[in-house]
């Protein structure tokens, strides 16, 4: 139903606390450089205005769209051009163009210092002084660094953060209580951020159909007992919610998400028995619980897929009469039977099936043409299975650090034009997938690996789009969302790349490396490794092993020496010469 005042409606639905949090997230995600205080001032102004509209929905400006109200607020900031440069040009546009313009200025990689965690004592002091302000600051800091973070989920993490501090700030050993809790929140929040970024990229770059297909696959895996019609209903609502959040309409998104959770709880009998435990929880926890829900058991006696999708003489008729519904049903039926497959695999299989029907249904004897379709789709299952098996074997053999090094070499050979810090960052992220997934049972390994890789490659694609350096990366990123991972896997040494001239500076180390924390030490060594590959992209595995071995021995020797700097000064050039000889 239409409301006289949209902002009053959302304020009433969400309540003041969540309303203020969402306004703060909206502002922080769009105005990523502004100080916290400035945002707090704007949040209070917007909240006061919303309250006035609740009191009288016909009051001046209360009838305006929320996006327009936000845009007007942003454009009234006196220092806007000074702080944000050409973002201020958006203010000359009319909505909805102004909204689109603001979105285009969101920065996925803002030049902000890492969000450092203060010492537990300092944390607790600040929290006790003013916990609302403290949590507001958390929302602000996370939002400006993650401009597409799923806003209602961020409110959930803020609540978890608050609960951890409430409990641990009273504990005798604050650090022992807080550290594991905050580490867990941080790790989960980062994954949540990456998941939402992939959803937004899917919608923005590949359209609604791509996102809906992704959602059908995921929900069919989680709720295999639900009918296709029920899955479709949820997918339609979920698409609306996700579009709103990706578009920056966070109040609408959070409210509609609440509605979707309510709908699912009211219809849990026809969706999943697992919803019971979620539906008794309060709003934020309920929606989060549904998002993270364990998959339901498969219904027994499911007929063979071939019955409806191969043997049935009506396949082409059904395909012609309602292509998307028919393919959606195929994706649903396939996904609910295969919870162990990744979303990417399921979508590639559905795409393969669609392509087969496109070809066969145009023939005089379609059935003879598509009769063996499942055999022909088997490579789409075998390829990722084999890849995961090989990579997990390598991970088990080398450990996380060694596996990261192998990936650093592999990805530098694929895209040597990419900057060294970026290649190291992605090699480390890709390597950590081994730690996350390789120890899981066989049934979960495959989906864990490919689903995580999709998140990592999406981030790589987003940053590469901002400053493109490799045509091959652009091609893999833009041609097809579901084929991104296979596309990157299929890349080998870039034959067009002109090797980088040798710079001794890239391989010069000093005694300071010895005192660095282990992680930073590894990063420095991996930077050198990437530089080495850029210098000699076709070096053999044996040559690389030799060089890395010499390198490790050199570091150990010099870091153990009494006069470390002298050792680095003397042995460094010898090591460089030896490496050049090995790679010659």
């Amino acid at each position: 139903e239409a409301h006289k005042s949209e902002i009053a409606h959302r304020f009433n639905d969400l309540g003041e606390g969540h309303f203020k949090g969402l306004v703060l997230i909206t502002l922080s995600q769009h105005l990523q450089k502004s100080p916290f205080e400035e945002h707090v001032k704007l949040v209070n102004e917007v909240t006061d205005f919303a309250k006035a509209c609740v009191a009288d929905e016909s009051a001046q400006n209360c009838g305006k769209a929320i996006a327009t109200l936000f845009g007007d607020k942003v454009c009234a900031i006196p220092s806007l051009r000074e702080t944000y440069g050409e973002l201020a040009d958006c203010c000359a546009k009319e909505d909805p163009d102004r909204v689109e313009c603001f979105l285009q200025h969101k920065d996925d990689n803002p030049n902000l210092p890492p969000f450092e965690r203060p010492e537990p004592e300092a944390l607790c002091t600040a929290f006790k002084e003013n916990n609302d302000r403290f949590i507001g600051h958390y929302l602000y800091e996370v939002s400006r660094r993650h401009p597409y973070f799923y806003a209602p989920e961020l409110l959930y993490y803020a609540e978890k953060y608050k609960n951890a501090l409430t409990e641990c700030c009273e504990a005798a050993d604050k650090a022992a209580c807080l550290t594991p809790k905050l580490d867990a929140i941080k790790e989960k929040a980062l994954v949540s951020s990456a998941q939402q970024r992939l959803k937004c990229a899917s919608l923005q770059k590949f359209g609604e159909r791509a996102f809906k297909a992704w959602s059908v696959a995921r929900l069919s895996q989680k709720f295999p007992k639900a009918e296709f019609a029920e899955i479709s209903t949820i997918v339609t609502s979920l698409t609306k919610v996700t579009k709103e959040c990706c578009h920056g309409d966070l109040l609408e998104c959070a409210d509609d998400r609440q509605e979707l959770a309510k709908y699912m709880c009211e219809h849990q009998d026809s969706i999943s028995s697992k919803l019971k435990e979620c539906c008794v929880k309060p709003t934020l926890q309920k929606a989060h619980c549904i998002l993270e829900i364990q998959r339901d058991e498969l219904p027994t006696e499911l007929p063979d897929l071939a019955v409806d999708f191969v043997e049935d003489k009506e396949v082409c008729k059904n395909f012609a009469e309602a292509k998307d519904v028919f393919l959606g049903t195929f994706l649903y039926e396939y996904s609910r039977r295969h919870p162990e497959y990744s979303i990417g695999m399921l979508l590639r299989i559905a795409k393969g099936y669609e392509a087969k029907l496109e070809k066969c249904c145009a023939e005089a004897d379609p059935h003879a043409c598509y009769a063996k379709v499942f055999d022909e789709l088997q490579p789409l299952i075998d390829e990722p299975k084999k890849l995961v098996q090989q990579n997990c074997e390598l991970f088990d053999k080398l450990g996380e650090y060694g596996f990261q090094n192998a990936l650093a070499v592999r990805y530098t050979q694929k895209a040597p034009q990419v900057s060294t810090p970026t290649l190291v960052e992605y090699a480390r992220k890709l390597g950590s997938v081994g730690t996350k997934c390789c120890s899981l049972p066989e049934t979960e390994r495959l989906s864990c690996t490919e689903n995580y890789l999709a998140l990592i490659l999406n981030r790589l694609c987003i940053l590469h789009e901002k400053t493109p350096v490799s045509e091959r990366v652009t091609k893999c990123c833009t041609e097809s969302l579901v084929n991104r991972r296979p596309c990157f896997s299929a890349l080998h040494v870039d034959e067009t790349y002109v090797p980088k001239p040798f710079h001794a500076d890239s391989f010069t180390f000093h005694a300071d490396i010895c005192t660095l924390p282990e992680k930073e030490k590894q990063v420095k060594k991996q930077m050198a490794l990437v530089e080495l590959v850029k210098h000699k992209p076709k070096a053999s595995e044996e040559q690389m092993k030799t060089v890395m071995g010499d390198f490790a021995a050199f570091l150990k020797k010099c870091c153990d020496a009494d006069n470390k700097e002298a050792c680095f000064t003397e042995d460094g050039p010898k090591l460089v010469a030896k490496c050049q000889a090995t790679l010659a």
């Epitope: 082409c316 395909f319 496109e358």
Partner: nanobody, 115 residues
Framework: DVQLVESGGGVVQPGGSLRLSCAAS????????MSWVRQAPGKGPEWVSS????????LYADSVKGRFTISRDNSKNTLYLQMNSLRPEDTALYYC????????SGQGTLVTVSS
Amino acid sequence: DVQLVESGGGVVQPGGSLRLSCAASGFTFTSFGMSWVRQAPGKGPEWVSSISGSGSDTLYADSVKGRFTISRDNSKNTLYLQMNSLRPEDTALYYCTIGGSLSRSGQGTLVTVSS
């Protein structure tokens, strides 16, 4: 919505000819092979003939081979069945279908071969 409208049936003497038409709409006609299916009174559906989307490939049931010719005009989204040397056993309701389907979408057109 997919629509198939058959026409051209009628009463004809044994040895005579008829040309059936099927006007298609609501889908990409050229992307689909089309078939003619018939159903004699009191019997199940029987496949008669099929043609590929481009019109280059055709298939016929043994019972009609050499007598019937299937064709299509993709510019008009229309399927045809030229029936020559008709026999009494060809009497049936004829309808067109998408792909190899045997189920009817249109109302069909009745062909009666009788002296």
